[in-house]
Interface confidence: low
């Protein structure tokens, strides 16, 4: 807490400018009007205040807005955002995607902090669902964002938003998350032709049921082994040797290298040895 002291004569700030850099902490507290600061927040970022000085500026905003900052101030916080706690951010009502982008830009290139996670949570809850523009923005800054959501949270993602998802955005998703996302992707891409559809749906197949894998095996898709290894074991087990051979196409030879790993190991154990022998890979059931 900064002590309340009178502003020295002639030091009252008329505007937020670089002269304030020379003010001591108590002078900033005494001589900078909080309302002036709020209206000229966009200038703060261009002035190289020390972090100690930024603490004072934050304190002034906190006093002016005890119930939480208005969006007009939030949008221009810039590096002052790094000073905010999750508790501060929970008081905000952020509705503009531009505000979200401005604050994510401050943290760009770095791990998602608790502050950013809280900000995103507030923003998405305020919107009611994870729309395409928001998802586009979040995955651009944090490719792993989608996989950080719970299955319950993912259920609010509309199928139209799935078009914004890139393969790398799903790298860290677990089967429960893909179970939620796959039906949405199937719906989103349903009007595409065979080969284009497979390219788009491929990243989501970890959530695909057996009947969809059987259907894909009839379409000459040539699934690679990396994708096959991410399929749900319970979805792979009912597939016949012929169906797996069609599904993988020229990649079927890769089964030998993966014979000790799930789901290949469990699938092999379910097959008749005679059928496995038709692959000519020396797989032993």
């Amino acid at each position: 807490e900064v002590e309340k002291t009178a502003c020295p004569s002639g030091k009252k700030a008329r505007e937020i400018d670089e002269s304030l850099i020379f003010y001591k902490k108590w002078e900033l507290e005494a001589c900078v009007d909080a309302a002036l600061l709020a209206t000229q927040m966009d200038r703060v970022n261009a002035i190289p205040f020390t972090y100690e000085q930024l603490d004072v500026l934050k304190h002034k905003l906190d006093e002016l807005y005890p119930q939480g900052y208005p969006e007009s101030v939030i949008q221009h916080l810039g590096y002052l955002f790094l000073k905010m706690s999750p508790e501060d951010i929970r008081k905000w009502n952020v509705t503009s995607l531009e505000t979200l982008k401005a604050l994510l830009e401050v943290n760009k290139g770095h791990e998602m902090s608790p502050q950013v996670a809280t900000l995103i949570d507030r923003f998405v809850k305020g919107r009611g669902q994870l729309d395409k523009d928001t998802l586009d923005t979040l995955t651009a800054f944090y490719p792993g964002y989608l996989c950080s959501l719970s299955p319950e949270e993912l259920s609010s993602v509309p199928p139209s938003s799935i078009w914004a998802v890139r393969p790398q955005d799903l790298d860290t998703c677990d089967p429960r998350q893909l179970d939620v996302l796959y039906p949405k992707a199937r719906l989103a891409f349903q009007n595409m032709n065979g080969s284009e559809y497979f390219v788009k749906i491929q990243s989501f197949l970890g959530g695909a049921p057996t009947e969809d894998l059987k259907a894909l095996s009839q379409q000459n898709v040539s699934m690679d082994l990396a994708t096959f290894m991410k399929l749900r074991t319970d979805a792979v087990l009912p597939l016949t040797v012929a169906e797996v051979q069609k599904l993988l196409g020229p990649h079927v030879e890769g089964l030998k290298a993966e014979e000790r790993h799930r789901p290949v190991r469990d699938w092999i154990l379910r097959q008749r040895q005679d059928d496995l022998d038709t692959l000519g890979l020396g797989l032993q059931g």
């Epitope: 261009a46 002035i47 190289p48 205040f49 972090y51 100690e52 590096y79």
Partner: antibody, heavy 119, light 107 residues
């Protein structure tokens, strides 16, 4: 890709002057505060001077105050260090660096230019 | 001025080792500390900012911790390219100050 390229170093006699330049590319130069850091031969890093985004605020280490002047030309994406009354102890490689968040750490550095002060 | 004291000033280690370098400030600086790596005849490179945040593009074997006055840089699985000199720097207040450096050499 951010690039910072220093120039202007060389051999100068004690009491002489030099002007170092740092040409920046691959970044919005006018949006970042900049700094000069030096390193005497076989020694550690020493912060020399810093300048705000617009150039309106400057900072100096006590050891160079009154002798060195930092400036910038945002239209030319260039940072400068005017060094007067040079002393032997100013001999060093001079690096320009871009400052990160607020008064933050230096996220990009130039390759350095050697200044030798000797008679 | 805030003094930054690094220890050790040098150390010998082997590839695969876990290396720890400490940095102490003469007064509290919150988390406003950076770590840099410098190889001979090269410019320093930023590794860590805000005490523990990894600079973009830096391998995850580097990590930073600490706040207040005591800070640590850890290299968890020393690689041949990690033999270099490491510096800490405070940016809590002016003048900005660096530690004296820690040279990591091959054993």
């Amino acid at each position: 890709e951010v690039q910072l390229l220093e120039s202007g170093g060389g051999l100068v006699q004690p009491g002489g002057s030099l002007r170092l330049s740092c040409a920046a590319s691959g970044l919005t130069f006018r949006s970042y505060a900049m700094t000069w850091v030096r390193q005497a031969p076989g020694k550690g890093l020493e912060w020399v001077s810093g300048i705000s985004v617009s150039g309106g605020i400057t900072y100096y280490a006590e050891s160079v105050k009154g002798r060195f002047t930092i400036s910038r030309d945002n239209s030319k994406n260039t940072l400068y260090l005017q060094m007067n009354s040079l002393r032997a102890e100013d001999t060093a490689v001079y690096y320009c660096a871009k400052r990160g968040a607020a008064v933050g750490s230096f996220d990009y550095w130039g390759q350095g230019t050697l200044v030798t002060v000797s008679s | 001025d805030i003094q930054m004291t690094q220890s050790p000033s040098s150390l010998s280690a082997s590839v695969g080792d876990r290396v720890t370098i400490t940095c102490r400030s003469s007064q509290g600086i919150g988390s406003w500390l950076a770590w840099y790596q410098q190889k001979p005849e090269k410019a320093p490179q930023s590794l860590i900012y805000a005490a523990s945040s990894l600079q973009s593009g830096v391998p995850s074997r580097f990590s930073g911790s600490g706040s207040g006055t005591d800070f640590t840089l850890t290299i968890s699985n020393l690689q041949p390219e990690d033999f270099a000199t490491y510096y800490c720097q405070q940016y809590n207040s002016y003048p900005l100050t660096f530690g004296g450096g820690t040279k990591v050499e091959i054993k």
